[in-house]
Structure formats: C-alpha cells, structure tokens
Amino acid sequence: DAISSGDDEDDTDSSEDFVSENRSNQRAPYWTNTEKMEKRLHAVPAANTVKFRCPAGGNPTPTMRWLKNGKEFKQEHRIGGYKVRNQHWSLIMESVVPSDKGNYTCLVENEYGSINHTYHLDVVERSPHRPILQAGLPANASTVVGGDVEFVCKVYSDAQPHIQWIKHVEKNGSKYGPDGLPYLKVLKHSGINSSNAEVLALFNVTEMDAGEYICKVSNYIGQANQSAWLTVLPKQQAPVREKEITASPDYLE
C-alpha cells in the first residue's frame, strides 16, 4: 500500500511481513499480502510522502530491489534519496516532486526464482478541486410497493461539500415548466438538521416514487452530480437485481 500523508509513517504493523523459513522448505519467492498491493495507481499531492510495499516470502529469504521506469533506482536519482526498509519490503520517498512520477517495480528474488510488481506514481500539484463522486453510486435499485430502499452517494472533497438529493417531479401532468426547465424537488440536503446526507432512505415506497434520483454535490469550487433510477414493482413481483449503471459520468472533474 502507499501512504500519501505529509508525514513519514513508521512501520509499526502488528503483522510482520518478514518471513523466515527453515532450509528443508526451500521455495521460490511469493507474495505474502497481495491486498497491500492491489492499488497500482497512486496519485499523490506534491510534498507528500509515498510508501510502496511488496510483502514477500521465500526460502532462502529473497532479496528486494527497486527499479524506476525499468532501470535500477539509485539514491542519486532523486534529491533526498529514498529509504528501503527490507524487513517491511517497502520503498519510502519523502516530499515527492513532479520528477518522481513514473513506474516503480519491486523485484523480489532468490536462487529459486523471482517475482515483480509495478506501481505507477503520479505526483499532482495541489489545487482546489470540486467534489468527486465515487463511480457507480448512487446505484440503480428496485423494490416492491411498500418496500424500503436506500441510495448512497460517496463524496470526496477537501472543501466543505453541500449535498442535495433531487428528484424530477410532475406539476399538473407536466415534467417541464414554461421556461423549459424540469420541475425538481429537493428531497434532502446537508445542513444542521440533516443526518448523513450521503444516504437517501425511502420507506414504504409507492409507484409515485419511481424515477430518477440525483445526488448533486457542490463546494465553493464547483459541482458534480450522478443519478440512479428507482424501479417500483407491483407487490406480487419480486425485485430483480439489475446490472448497476450510472446515468451520468463516473465523476465530473
């Protein structure tokens, strides 16, 4: 995994990744914790600390070396160098700068074989950004008349976000006003009296509740929105798990 905080984090994991084995059980290198290696792309703000890990085992204990863009990564290749903590199978770079961008490959080897894993580091200059919404949320849902349903909108924003849940409604049988704009109803918004604005819960739904639900998030920089559809089925029909799709882009940024 990688950290991208302003401070170097000490390796104080309770689970030790360093595995020693006896001679009778000789083995080529293998990964001991693939969960910590799942995230390959790391976009990190400039000046932060980055840590890449490749927890491995093998007998004899493998050696680890790091490559940058396929070539040997030397201390003199970056101002301030870098730290390698072999017992934690980690590479640590402090105060990253744009020139640190690239592919970082850990090469783990012993006399019985070698394995490698590549991370991609992107160093982003720090700028204010509008809200980013998690792809696929809110997700389409279906329920029977009288059922309950929940829509979730996951928001990432450095700045204070304002969340609104909006539904297209009809007035006098029309979906649009004289100005050509759709009739919209704000169902919930973040504020003093609103608990957990990222979740919209609907109880005891009727056919009238079917339709498109929009999660609209704004901060002082801009806005983002994503939507999902609610299908309300007659009582005798069981809900069908449909393929979840988003009605708008993954995220607006």
Partner: antibody
C-alpha cells in the same frame, strides 16, 4: 494556463446600470464556479456571488441580492455581472475569480459619479 | 454570516524574520480557510487553501495551520518581495467572507 480577462473601467451616472464581463480561457469554463468579489478601501474584499456555468446555478451574498445579477455565455466562455440602481457606494474594483479563487481577473474599476 | 477577524491591521518585520498572521472565525469552519496575498495594484493571489494546503507554485516559506475557529498564516523567512496585504477567507459556507487584511511592512 487559465486566464481571466475583465472588461475595462466604467464611469457611470447614479441610478444607471452597468454590465461587466470576464472572459475565461485556458481551462474548461463550465467545470468551475465563477465568483465575483468587490473591493473598496473601506470594506475590503466582499464576496458578491457565484455562478456555475454548466447549469447556470447561482448563489448570492444576501447583501448583493437585487443589486447584482450573474449570467454566463457558454459559447464564448464569458461570465457577466450586471449591477443596477447604481450609487456612489457601488464605486469599487470588481474581480472575477475561478472556482477555487486560484485564478483572478485583473479587476474592473467602476466609478459612479454625476 | 461568518465573520473572519484579523486582529492586526499592520505588522512590521525584517527580512529573514519569521512572521505569523492570525485569523479568527466567528464559528467553526473546520479547515475551510484560504490565505491570499495582494500587492498594490494587483489582484489577490491564492497562497494557502483548506487551512494548510500550499497552492501550486507557492514557495515553501509560506505555511498555514489551524482548524475550527483559529487559523495562522506563517512566513518562515520574510523576503523583501513579501511586502503586501494578506487576507484570510472562509470557504465553509456561503457567503464566503474575507478577513479585513493584515498589511506586512518590511523594516
């Protein structure tokens, strides 16, 4: 590189209206709020309001509601602010600023005088 | 409206000195505070946002800290070109209010 170009200085009579512009370039105009800020020696910097060009959503400082009207022309990536019923109190430098207040126009000086 | 108070209208300092400017919000604004530098005849320039994030290209002698209601902007080693007025602003909720400004003079 984002750039905001504001219209030139204005000298107007009390009671009149004025419409100033802010032309954006170098970034996706519709993706960021456009803020308007008033500056006077007495009151300092005052936030007037903002508009989100993608859908025209506006947010105003209560103090400037009825005084300022914010609009955009997406086709020319230009934001506008109209000030109405002008008095000497409206004499100031007016800035437009991109969403995160990270890029500012050079300012438009408005003088209200008879 | 949230009131942002910069207690010092003027501060005098020397080149190489460390200087800190404070700003107090009338209510909790979490870390939603920005700092700007404005030189005579120029537009304000963003230095710090979200209380402590140094904006792209801003020299590392400029730093911001604080959360809740109390915020500090620090120049670790003042340079002659830092002569300017410095403003805080809350971007927690609309209207996004500014402090009255602190004019930094170089002795």
């Amino acid at each position: 590189q984002p750039y905001l170009q504001q219209s030139g200085a204005e000298l107007v009579r009390p009671g009149a209206s004025v419409k100033m512009s802010c032309k954006a370039s170098g970034y996706t105009f519709t993706s960021y709020n456009m803020h308007w800020v008033k500056q006077t020696p007495r009151q300092g910097l005052e936030w007037i309001g903002a508009i989100f060009p993608e859908n025209g959503d506006t947010s105003y400082n209560q103090k400037f509601k009825g005084k300022a009207t914010l609009t955009v022309d997406k086709s020319s990536s230009t934001a506008y602010m109209q000030l109405s019923s002008l008095t000497s109190e409206d004499s100031a430098v007016y800035f437009c600023a991109r969403g995160g207040f990270d890029y500012w126009g050079q300012g438009t000086t408005l003088t209200v005088s008879s | 409206d949230i009131v942002m108070t910069q207690s010092h209208k003027f501060m005098s300092t020397s080149v190489g000195d460390r200087v800190s400017i404070t700003c107090k919000a009338s209510q909790d604004v979490s870390t939603n505070v920005a700092w700007y530098q404005q030189k005579p005849g120029q537009s304000p320039k963003l230095l710090i946002f979200s209380a402590s994030y140094r904006y792209t290209g801003v020299p590392d002698r400029f730093a911001g800290s604080g959360s809740g209601t109390d915020f500090t902007f620090t120049i670790s080693s003042v340079q002659a070109e830092d002569l300017a007025v410095y403003y805080c602003q809350q971007h927690y909720s609309s209207p996004y209010t500014f402090g009255g400004g602190t004019k930094l003079d170089i002795k």
